[in-house]
Interface confidence: medium
């Protein structure tokens, strides 16, 4: 729960950046072009780098906690490394001209400092005991109190990044992750299904048998109809799944060579918004004690949208939050999914948790009967799959969305790419289905506008 992490998930990124040789924007002007640097570094043995002015000299890299002050004057001579000043660090051996600035924990987000910044390690931030982290975006989390499940039982205990999942006792229903008495259940709310017997009794026992029986008969009649509908849908899905195996699995690979020369438009990252020009309230929040944060989370069928992948407008946005869209897709339909997904290997495109359009397009186009296999291949455990199904109740597609969002949240940005999904689908012999995902995301102009995402 209150376990430690580096604020904004910086540490793994920093390590990666230092190893690969990509540097934060503040240092970008001080280092050579990435491609050149990679070529140059590969000439020298590990732990050394090529002298920027003399490519016949390999200089020793600086240890973590230090930075490059001056390159080595000649072969076998020492590199001039200086220790990072207070408030800065380097977490691995490097040849950075400046140390990286220490991160600060976000007090207004309820974060607490687990360990201070040292010259060789960034600040580690986390939450207090009995709190969990809710990620509003990939690198910004807020601490919330874990639900206590009063008038219910803990189905799944609170975890570092996940609130407690409660199951309510009889006579109580779940509202905003708390068990509320059925006496607070209004007819219009979703709780009527869970509190049906109590609601009927409230009418008064003097009512004749028909007033009690009639709603029950209607209810069970509707249940039977639902089961019948589900049965039909299941049969349809089985048929659809077989069709997918035949059509999706086989057709595209046979055509692989057909469009080899075709160039494709890569996904364009959505430009960040600048702060509002009109009004800017005083910068930052006033620190609010972390105990003031409480979360609630309800999953009701009413919240299930029409899941046709939404067509994008200007700059669509979770967050993850978990939970928010960050990638604007190229508007041209792309003819050959295989090539596009393979091309993305050169420059992997991040798939954002916050991009419902992308995730729902995947949900829509992976055959339902092969969904669990798909998410297992992405690394989700059966326990997680069951939990997300349970959490999302009767809304299967929302559960599937949550599974993808969970995968996205915990997969490093560089790895959670369209290319990876493509690889998994190819391993499942479902590569052709990518074409449908493409169409859903950037598809033909003829597609009708998507319905509203909510009710």
């Amino acid at each position: 729960m209150g376990l430690s992490t580096v604020p904004d998930l910086l540490l793994p990124l920093v390590l990666l950046e230092l190893l690969v040789g990509i540097y934060p924007s503040g240092v970008i002007g001080l280092v050579p072009h990435l491609g050149d640097r990679e070529k140059r570094d590969s000439v020298c043995p590990q732990g050394k780098y090529i002298h920027p002015q003399n490519n016949s000299i390999c200089c020793t890299k600086c240890h973590k906690g230090t930075y490059l002050y001056n390159d080595c004057p000649g072969p076998g001579q020492d590199t001039d490394c200086r220790e990072c000043e207070s408030g800065s660090f380097t977490a691995s051996e490097n040849h950075l001209r400046h140390c990286l600035s220490c991160s600060k924990c976000r007090k207004e987000m309820g974060q607490v400092e687990i360990s201070s910044c040292t010259v060789d390690r960034d600040t580690v931030c986390g939450c207090r005991k009995n709190q969990y982290r809710h990620y509003w975006s990939e690198n910004l989390f807020q601490c919330f109190n874990c639900s206590l499940c009063l008038n219910g039982t803990v189905h799944l205990s609170c975890q570092e990044k996940q609130n407690t999942v409660c199951t309510c006792h009889a006579g109580f229903f779940l509202r905003e992750n708390e068990c509320v008495s059925c006496s607070n259940c209004k007819k219009s709310l979703e709780c009527t299904k869970l509190c049906l017997p109590q609601i009927e009794n409230v009418k008064g026992t003097e009512d004749s048998g028909t007033t009690v029986l009639l709603p029950l008969v209607i209810f069970f009649g509707l249940c039977l109809l639902s089961l019948l509908f589900i049965g039909l849908m299941y049969r349809y899905q089985r048929w659809k799944s077989k069709l997918y195996s035949i059509v999706c699995g086989k057709s595209t690979p046979e055509k692989e060579g057909e469009l080899e020369g075709t160039t494709t438009k890569p996904l364009a990252p959505n430009p960040s918004f600048s702060p509002t020009p009109g009004f800017t309230p005083t910068l930052g929040f006033s620190p609010v004690p972390s105990s003031t944060f409480t979360s609630s989370s309800t999953y009701t069928p009413g919240d299930c949208p029409n899941f046709a992948a939404p067509r994008r407008e200007v700059a669509p946005p979770y967050q993850g939050a978990d939970p928010i869209l960050a990638t604007a897709l190229a508007s041209d339909p792309i003819p050959n999914p295989l090539q596009k997904w393979e091309d993305s290997a050169h420059k992997p495109q991040s798939l954002d948790t916050d991009d419902p359009a992308t995730l729902y397009a995947v949900v829509e186009n992976v055959p339902p009967l092969r969904w669990k296999e798909f998410v297992r291949r992405l690394g989700l455990s059966d326990h997680e799959i069951d939990r997300l199904e349970l959490q999302n109740g009767r809304c299967l597609r929302e559960a599937q969305y949550s599974m993808l969002a969970t995968w996205r949240r915990r997969t490093p940005r560089r790895e959670a790419t369209l290319e990876l999904l493509g690889r998994v689908l190819r391993d499942m012999d479902l590569l052709g289905c990518l074409e449908d995902i493409e169409e859903a995301l950037c598809g033909p102009a003829a597609l009708p506008p998507a319905p509203s995402l909510l009710r």
């Epitope: 990939e138 905003e176 959505n270 918004f273 919240d303 407008e313 967050q319 939970p323 869209l325």
Partner: nanobody, 122 residues
Framework: EVQLLESGGGLVQPGGSLRLSCAAS????????MGWVRQAPGKGLEWVSS????????YYADSVKGRFTISRDNSKNTLYLQMNSLRAEDTAVYYC???????????????WGQGTLVTVSS
Amino acid sequence: EVQLLESGGGLVQPGGSLRLSCAASGFTFATYNMGWVRQAPGKGLEWVSSIAWLGSETYYADSVKGRFTISRDNSKNTLYLQMNSLRAEDTAVYYCAKHCKAECTGDLFDYWGQGTLVTVSS
């Protein structure tokens, strides 16, 4: 251009209720998390509540939990804050705000409205 316009503020007695609305335009409202933040006179900003883009997840500060309810109508591009059992300490300018997306590393919100004043006084 992103625009957020709050309304519904005013003077109310302790224990009373108010419903704030926020009309959004200039972005795809249905796909963004939204929230409310307030600033009491002479104090800093305080996060009040947030709602996920689908409306299925809601988050509240403890100081307002059980009294305030955040909701949204994506078909109307509108965010709401129902405030019940209001107290004197709820007096503040209430800002509707659009949550920052994953590429933002700084603040929780990237766009704010002009704010609407809520005064709780007898």
